[in-house]
């Protein structure tokens, strides 16, 4: 057995997510490295006051830490910094963004890679540059979506070691030529960008050369601007049931969402015998509510020991700044008898219940539903 | 019936690593959220890990972040937990648990295996 | 992180008496409170959820009650197999999920 009854109505506040939290980058530094972290605010809209933590402990701002909303920067790192780093919101300690820190005695490309592309003696007494792990230089075309890291790479050797720089859209390229900075791992033969963004978009080239001579690549960065959408409902849930008088339902519904959304468990209900009110609007009552905090959400709506006015029409609606997306289904509760007849029915028909998909935009509901409170309603029976 | 069978446990020194494992039946496994919790000797619960029903959203405490990793497998109606860089404070029982919804409690749990860290 | 304040830590009373154990969010949480049972050397057992509904095949001596900071769990008369710890969980805010620290039922 599952869980019982739930609740009439459960409210959340709503909360600001910035990036998920599940989202955890894992950055590895070198020893004498600046560490920089970039937290930009969700969805591109105001951060508000924030506080940087490590390990569970609020950073002091300091000569070599260097703290501010949406960024902190730790200079000339050691062992010691090695931790985990969050921004959160100040009032609520919301976590807006999540860092794993590894600070080891040896520069480092900041991924898990680390050390697999550094120069090697190949016993060669000289030689041009070669690329020493071409297959890895494959993908030219790169487009990530904004706020994301970009490593470019290309590692080589050659006797004497040498030299990488790098151009962008075939002109020499440093730090402050962007918002954010560089970072340039001469070791590992690359070009870090953090939290891109659409001028970052262009051509980069790796320029790799010593006295023999000179080779280069170039990969392409696309920065993907992303278009926040309303909520989607995973196709056939919940599905349509029918269930035996007293025994217990339970639905599914599963919400994705980029920006926080509202879901309810709705129920059309009758006002003094009418499903509609004045304006036609159908009436409805709140089962459960809340404010989810993921990307992706599992909800469930349990009724126990249902009686035939469970019976009706549903709603799983979910609800973000930029529309709604909502599916209905029914319940249907029969006697014992009748309900086994209509499950063989369902069988040979090949699943008889199972709802089609319907995604409705805030357009085309035509106007709110009226929602109904308990008192409002007429002999209306909820568990 | 809902089932859920944790295995891997054992003796292991401070730095070394080890894979749990959940085997899960009497329910649709793809369909439900999954979460690690621990408890240490004569201590109180400690939830560690969260999966989302797809993989693709997970979640960890402070406590074990950046040195356990959780994953699932719905073709084997599984749940793993990789464990490395060990500790003596990681020693307890872990606990392999059915989240009921986003919102819900943890309505099933397995019997618990117990990792014990020592040199 | 929110966290679960369980009071008493430990309580020690006979069979039939009624029981109350309560737990402190230090934050409003709603009504997303869940209580869990463990007996020694097994593993817990959710007893409610949402602050007040009883889960399935948990006896009906077993109430809880409450929501935003204040929760209380009750046992209306104490029978033998009741003695136990006892947690409190909240699944308002996640992550982390949090635990009271937990109440030790114990036979006077």
């Known amino acids: 057995e599952s869980l019982g009854t739930e609740q009439r109505v459960v409210g959340r506040v709503a909360e600001v997510s910035g990036p998920e939290p599940s989202q955890q980058e894992q950055l590895v530094f070198g020893s004498g490295d600046a560490v920089e972290l970039s937290c930009p605010p969700p969805g591109g809209g105001p951060m508000g006051p924030t506080v940087w933590v490590k390990d569970g402990a609020g950073l002091v701002p300091s000569e070599r830490v260097l703290v501010g909303p949406q960024r902190l920067q730790v200079l000339n790192a050691s062992h010691e910094d090695s931790g985990a780093y969050s921004c959160r919101q100040r009032l609520t300690q919301l976590v807006l963004c999540h860092f794993s820190v590894r600070v080891t005695d040896a520069p480092s490309s900041g991924d898990d890679e680390d050390g697999e592309d550094e120069a090697e003696d190949t016993g060669v007494d000289t030689g041009a540059p070669y690329w020493t792990r071409p297959e890895r230089m494959d993908k030219k075309l790169l487009a990530v979506p904004a706020a994301n890291t970009v490593r470019f790479r290309c590692p080589a050797a050659g006797n004497p070691t040498p030299s990488i720089s790098w151009l962008k859209n075939g002109k020499e390229f440093r730090g402050e030529h962007r918002i954010g900075g560089i970072k340039l791992r001469h070791q590992q033969w690359s070009l870090v960008m953090e939290s891109v963004v659409p001028s970052d978009r262009g051509n980069y080239t790796c320029v790799v050369e010593n006295k023999f001579g000179s080779i280069r690549q170039t990969y392409t960065l696309d920065v993907l601007e992303r278009s926040p959408h309303r909520p989607i409902l995973q196709a056939g849930l919940p599905a349509n049931q029918t269930a035996v008088l007293g025994s217990d339902v339970e639905f599914h519904c599963k919400v994705y969402s980029d920006a926080q959304p509202h879901i309810q468990w709705l129920k059309h209900v009758e006002v003094n015998g009418s499903k509609v009110g004045p304006d036609g609007t159908p009436y409805v009552t709140v089962l459960k509510s809340w404010i989810s905090e993921s990307v992706e959400a599992d909800v469930r709506l349990r009724l126990a020991n249902v009686s035939e006015r469970d019976g009706g029409e549903y709603l799983c609606r979910a609800t973000n700044f930029i529309g709604v997306a909502e599916k209905a289904f029914w319940l249907s509760v029969h006697g014992p008898r009748a309900a086994e007849e209509e499950l063989v029915e369902a069988d040979e028909a090949g699943s008889v219940y199972a709802g089609e998909q319907k995604l409705i935009s805030e357009e085309d509901l035509g106007g709110e539903q009226k929602l109904i409170s308990e008192e409002d309603l007429h002999h209306h029976h909820h568990h | 019936e809902v089932q859920l069978v944790e295995s891997g446990g054992g003796l292991v020194q401070p730095g070394g690593s080890l894979r749990l494992s959940c085997i899960v039946s009497?329910?649709?496994?793809?369909?439900?959220?999954m979460s690690w919790l621990r408890q240490a000797p004569g201590k109180g619960l400690e939830w560690i890990s969260y999966i989302s029903s797809s993989g693709r959203v997970i979640y960890y405490a402070d406590s074990v972040k950046g040195r356990f990793t959780i994953s699932r497998d719905s073709a084997k109606n599984s749940l793993y937990l990789e464990m490395n860089s060990l500790r003596a404070e990681d020693t307890a029982i872990y606990y392999c648990t059915r989240k009921w919804d986003s919102s819900g409690p943890f309505d099933f749990w397995g019997q618990g295996t117990l990792v014990t860290v020592s040199s | 992180d929110i966290q679960m304040t369980q009071s008493p830590s430990s309580l020690s009373a006979s069979v039939g008496d009624r029981v109350t154990i309560t737990c402190r969010a230090s934050?409003?949480?709603?009504?997303?409170l869940n209580w869990y049972q463990q007996k020694p050397g097994k593993a817990p057992k959710l007893l409610i959820y949402a602050a007040s509904s009883l889960q399935s095949g948990v006896p009906s001596r077993f109430s809880g009650s409450g929501s935003g900071t204040d929760f209380t769990l009750t046992i209306s008369s104490l029978q033998p197999e009741d003695f136990a710890t006892y947690y409190c969980?909240?699944?308002?805010?996640?992550?982390?999920?949090?635990f009271g620290q937990g109440t030790r039922l114990e036979i006077k």
């Open positions: 934050q409003s949480i709603s009504s997303y």
């Open positions: 969980q909240q699944s308002y805010s996640t992550p982390p999920i949090t």
């Open positions: 009497g329910f649709i496994f793809s369909s439900y959220e």
